[in-house]
């Protein structure tokens, strides 16, 4: 129950905190669980205990194992276990799952990526940051204290981010790296009754007989990702697919756009080779979501060809 997994790379510093906390004044004893051998507190040792911290400076693969810490409070000896695994350094760029810290999510307004475990170390700024093993460059990236700030976050910013810093212990420097995944999520959105931006209600659209015509139904539904939101066209109150006129088709798929942060959808109705009978039809742009349905009606009228000679 009071057990914690810790991991690191060989030849890097690794500092582990006892899973049992306590007042700073409490004595903490560390043992190597398999042998019950006490971990020394003298800093000249490569592996030594320092209060609630167990330090590997630097770590070796052979250090892997379970370590016991006992926090001696005035009333009880409280026991915790640190399960430490030290891995060999990978030659390629890929960071395996077992070396990854918890995934963090960011959005356009909040894009901080904290360097995991850094608070355990004696480090000085700046941190070095890498994404998918490439050093981050450019004004969009700012290393600030123990975190990375990304300006104008985009979905392409998702990926694995590695922070690299130097731990200093009594004048000796040790490298530390830590990697975590970053995902980009939409800002907290909201949903509202559909608002049709086009066409206007009872709009008259001029078309030329024999030519092609496009009608666009465009509506907004709120902010952020929307569920069960759709726009579509009807002819005389009938779905396009059921109307049975092959010249009149809805554009496959709905285009999602974000206008001023709003989530909007549009659907294009394409009429090929406009005929006289098309002018008699009622064209309904429908926008619907969980709040309800809004309908704007369009009619077609004949557009007189412009006489360029007059």
């Amino acid at each position: 129950k009071f057990s914690k997994q810790s991991w690191g790379l060989e030849n890097e510093a690794l500092i582990v905190r006892c899973p049992r906390q306590g007042k700073p004044s409490y004595t903490v004893d560390w043992y190597y669980s398999q042998t019950n051998k006490s971990i020394p507190t003298q800093e000249r040792n490569r592996v030594f205990a320092s209060g609630q911290l167990l330090k590997f400076l630097p770590a070796a693969v052979a250090d892997s194992g379970i370590y016991t810490c006992i926090v001696r409070s005035p009333t009880f000896n409280r026991t915790g276990y640190a399960n430490v695994t030290i891995y060999k350094k990978q030659s390629d760029c890929n960071v395996p799952d077992y070396l990854m810290y918890s995934t963090v999510s960011g959005s356009e307004k909040n894009s901080k990526i904290y360097c995991p475990t850094i608070d355990l170390y004696n480090w000085t700024a700046p941190l070095e940051w890498f994404k998918n093993c490439q050093a981050l460059q450019g004004s969009r990236y700012r290393a600030h204290k123990s975190f990375l700030v990304i300006d104008n976050v985009m979905t392409e910013d998702a990926g694995d981010y590695t922070c690299k810093f130097i731990h200093n212990e009594n004048g000796a420097n040790y490298s530390v790296t830590a990697t975590r995944s970053f995902t980009v999520k939409d800002e907290q959105g909201f949903s509202l009754f559909p608002v049709i931006g086009a066409p206007a209600q009872n709009e008259i659209k001029e078309v030329e007989i024999g030519k092609n015509a496009n009608l666009t139904c465009s509506a907004c539904f709120g902010k952020g990702t929307q569920f069960l939101a759709a726009v579509l066209w009807q002819l005389n109150g009938t779905k396009i697919t059921d109307f049975g006129e092959p010249r009149i088709q809805q554009e496959e798929g709905q285009n999602q756009s974000f206008s001023n942060g709003l989530a909007c959808l549009d659907m294009v109705l394409r009429i090929a080779d406009v005929k006289e009978e098309d002018l008699l039809l009622q064209y309904d742009c429908l926008a619907l979501n969980l709040h309800g349905l809004r309908r704007h009606t369009v009619r077609l009228s004949r557009k007189n060809p412009i006489d360029h000679h007059s």
Partner: antibody
């Protein structure tokens, strides 16, 4: 939310024993040590002892070492304190209590409502 | 064991008055906790780790001190503050409380 529900008032004969209970809810019983404190007119609050429900380990105020026995039943999330060889001086209110953050011993943040023990012939 | 001595044992204060009560430990302690108890009710954690206010405690309360000398202060007494206040150390076994300071409304 964390709640500690103590058993009702007890009237016992001098020299007899009594067992008080404290049922915990709203948290994982084995994650926090349970402490017992009493309130006396003369000394005010006095710490009696404590038990770690996970291990059964106990810690006592030496003054109460022969007087109190602490146990815990993990299955019912209940801590018990048996008081024996009762005298009139044991006629006080007994509380079970626990810290807010067990490991940091940051004061007794949660208290039972108290059990009044009356020792009388 | 560490003996905690609270003073005064009883005190009274008028509304708006500043109140200070002290707790002296027979040996040095690292932290002090304070509890408020009103008649017929369980104690309440009031100040912990010397100076941190427990949840719901008004900001007019404060705690300070180190070593063997600690105090609880109310910047402006209010009627609801009338109660008995106990200090407690958690630095050595046995855990010990002071005998309490009874604060009355004048």
């Amino acid at each position: 939310q964390v709640q500690l529900q103590q058993s009702g008032a007890e009237l016992v004969r001098p020299g007899a024993s009594v067992t008080l209970s404290c049922k915990a809810s709203g948290y994982t019983f084995t994650d926090s040590e349970m402490y017992w404190v009493r309130l006396t007119p003369v000394h005010g609050l006095e710490w009696i002892g404590a038990i770690d429900p996970e291990t059964g380990d106990t810690a006592f105020n030496q003054k109460f070492k022969g007087k109190a026995t602490l146990t815990a039943d993990k299955s019912s999330s209940t801590a018990y304190m048996e008081l024996r060889s009762l005298t009139s001086e044991d006629s006080v209110v007994y509380y079970c209590t626990r810290a807010f953050d067990n490991d940091n011993d940051d004061g007794f943040a949660y208290w039972g409502q108290g059990t009044l023990v009356t020792v009388s012939a | 064991q560490i003996v905690m001595t609270q003073s005064p044992a009883i005190m009274s204060a008028s509304p708006g008055e500043k109140v200070t009560m002290t707790c002296s430990a027979s040996s040095s302690v690292n932290y002090m906790h304070w509890y408020q108890q009103k008649s017929g009710t369980s104690p309440k954690r009031w100040i912990y780790d010397t100076s941190k206010l427990a949840s719901g405690v008004p900001a007019r309360f404060s705690g300070s001190g180190s070593g063997t000398s600690y105090s609880l202060t109310i910047s402006s007494m209010e009627a609801e503050d009338a109660a008995t206040y106990y200090c407690q150390q958690w630095s050595s076994n046995p855990l010990t409380f002071g005998a309490g300071t009874k604060l009355e409304l004048k």
